[in-house]
Amino acid sequence: KKVVLGKKGDTVELTCTASQKKSIQFHWKNSNQIKILGNQGSFLTKGPSKLNDRADSRRSLWDQGNFPLIIKNLKIEDSDTYICEVEDQKEEVQLLVFGLTANSDTHLLQGQSLTLTLESPPGSSPSVQCRSPRGKNIQGGKTLSVSQLELQDSGTWTCTVLQNQKKVEFKIDIVVLAFQKASSIVYKKEGEQVEFSFPLAFTVEKLTGSGELWWQAERASSSKSWITFDLKNKEVSVKRVTQDPKLQMGKKLPLHLTLPQALPQYAGSGNLTLALEAKTGKLHQEVNLVVMRATQLQKNLTCEVWGPTSPKLMLSLKLENKEAKVSKREKAVWVLNPEAGMWQCLLSDSGQVLLESNIKVLPTWSTPVQP
């Protein structure tokens, strides 16, 4: 008995060939011996089976002695033994229809689990192997699970179902809902305008939800909500914003926040959460603000940074085109009795400058100028 594998929702063509290369009488029946279709001369006739409105043949092939049974929009319950009767012969074909679906939705939040469920006909014992877009292979039986989805899991998953040494391939598009970056740091000089951007790593037709930015200032004992907003069909509308600081928000995606000026009291860490409609859980992106200030008070030139800096960052004070006068892995450095000239305060990581602030030290009889 010939075995043919089919995919739920697809179309399958079961072949039946006569030795005579001409149109002769044929019938396709199911295992209950109920007629599915056949011919009456050059006319196609259909029986009362459940396949009545989904079964067809190719009349153009009848003259060549080919009498296929085409079944459209396959269902799991179409799995059956189909019998073609032609020239006093019976050809039997076993059709096994499989379906592979993702749990509830193919749009999942980062960190959530993906479960792929195989629908199979009774009596079958298929094996399934799936390959993720990043090349990870998972194997299983009726269900396959992947926990802690990552951004790289977005894309087409290719799953192969194996039964009776035959295979059928499924492709499932999975979208992992996440921000492009899990975390970002913005380095600013005191007084500069700060731009925070939260680009999403996916695109969908309609995006609706609500979000909030909580901020933990380095100097503050507790965090506070800086802004809450709604998202409707990719349009952003602010619901509530603090008076200090008074953040501004872009009306379109990507989510964009503007802090009018960087001040030491704002330096710290924020967590932007986005709750999407019809999704359990939230998207998160951490954002950090590091603020630098260079000042001269009497005979002391000081450079300070506030905010979440890594211990390996170097803070230096140097006179322009000269070697660093002071360089420390600390959040404040100073020079006593600095000589006149343009001083640079540098925050760097392995020689790469992250933040720079210049301060002009005038001869001792004048006051300092900050360009």
Epitope: H27, I34, Q40, T45, D53
Partner: antibody, heavy 120, light 107 residues
Framework: QVQLQESGPGLVKPSETLSLTCTVS????????WSWIRQPAGKGLEWIGR???????NYNPSLKSRITMSVDTSKNQFSLELSSVTAADTAVYYC??????????????WGQGTTVTVSS | DIQMTQSPSSLSASVGDRVTITCQAS??????LNWYQQKPGKAPKLLIY???NLETGVPSRFSGSGSGTDFTFTISSLQPEDIATYYC?????????FGGGTKVEIK
């Protein structure tokens, strides 16, 4: 044992729409074809059409342009609408369950039938 | 559509008689034929399926035969409770079609 009960007006005016409902009791409406068959007084049986629980239908070509069948699985009911009726549509209307089993396809359960008269 | 022609349209026989009804299809329907019995004021009841198979619970005096286009229904020994109209019905193709019926009466 599954039972079927037809309901609907016994009298319909010419050119109007005949509407009948069949309620399935003591069994599930799922995974069967449900049909309507009519019988004018003293005459033979005429298959009107059938509907599957998924909503897919097959109608008798002679009545196709006037028939609408629907199914409500939550209420265990299926319905027939026959538009633009004439006196020729006067008959006993049966709702029935069609069954497929080995070598058999046909009606295994019938309603008791409801008489519909088309008259002004 | 497949036309089903039943004959005779009515017959009268005595209790114990052998009664034969024929049904002819307008085209080859293999053995896709049912026979139903309908008593006055009642819904039809299945007696024979696939031309010759007796439905469970149906008395063995009822039988059927035939294939292709010509079919026969027989009551080997007519009983008073067999007074009814008998219909053949094809299920080779849709629409399902019935014969015109044969009314059986007792002499």
């Amino acid at each position: 044992q599954v039972q079927l009960q037809e309901s609907g007006p016994g009298l319909v005016k010419p050119s109007e729409t005949l509407s009948l409902t069949c309620t399935v009791s003591n069994g599930s409406i799922s995974d069967y074809y449900w049909s309507w068959i009519r019988q004018p007084a003293g005459k033979g049986l005429e298959w009107i059409g059938r509907i599957y629980t998924s909503g897919s239908t097959n109608y008798n070509p002679s009545l196709k342009s006037r028939i609408t069948m629907s199914v409500d699985t939550s209420k265990n009911q299926f319905s027939l609408e026959l538009s633009s009726v004439t006196a020729a549509d006067t008959a006993v209307y049966y709702c029935a369950r069609e069954l497929e089993r080995y070598y058999f396809y046909g009606v295994d359960v019938w309603g008791q039938g409801t008489t519909v008269t088309v008259s002004s | 559509d497949i036309q089903m022609t039943q004959s005779p349209s009515s017959l009268s026989a005595s209790v114990g008689d052998r009664v034969t009804i024929t049904c002819q299809a307008s085209q080859d329907i293999s053995n896709y034929l049912n026979w139903y019995q309908q008593k006055p004021g009642k819904a039809p009841k299945l007696l024979i399926y696939a031309a010759s198979n007796l439905e469970t619970g149906v008395p063995s005096r009822f039988s059927g035969s035939g294939s292709g286009t010509d079919f026969t229904f027989t009551i080997s020994s007519l009983q008073p409770e067999d007074i009814a109209t008998y219909y053949c019905q094809q299920y080779d193709s849709l629409p399902l079609t019935f014969g015109g019926g044969t009314k059986v009466e007792i002499k």
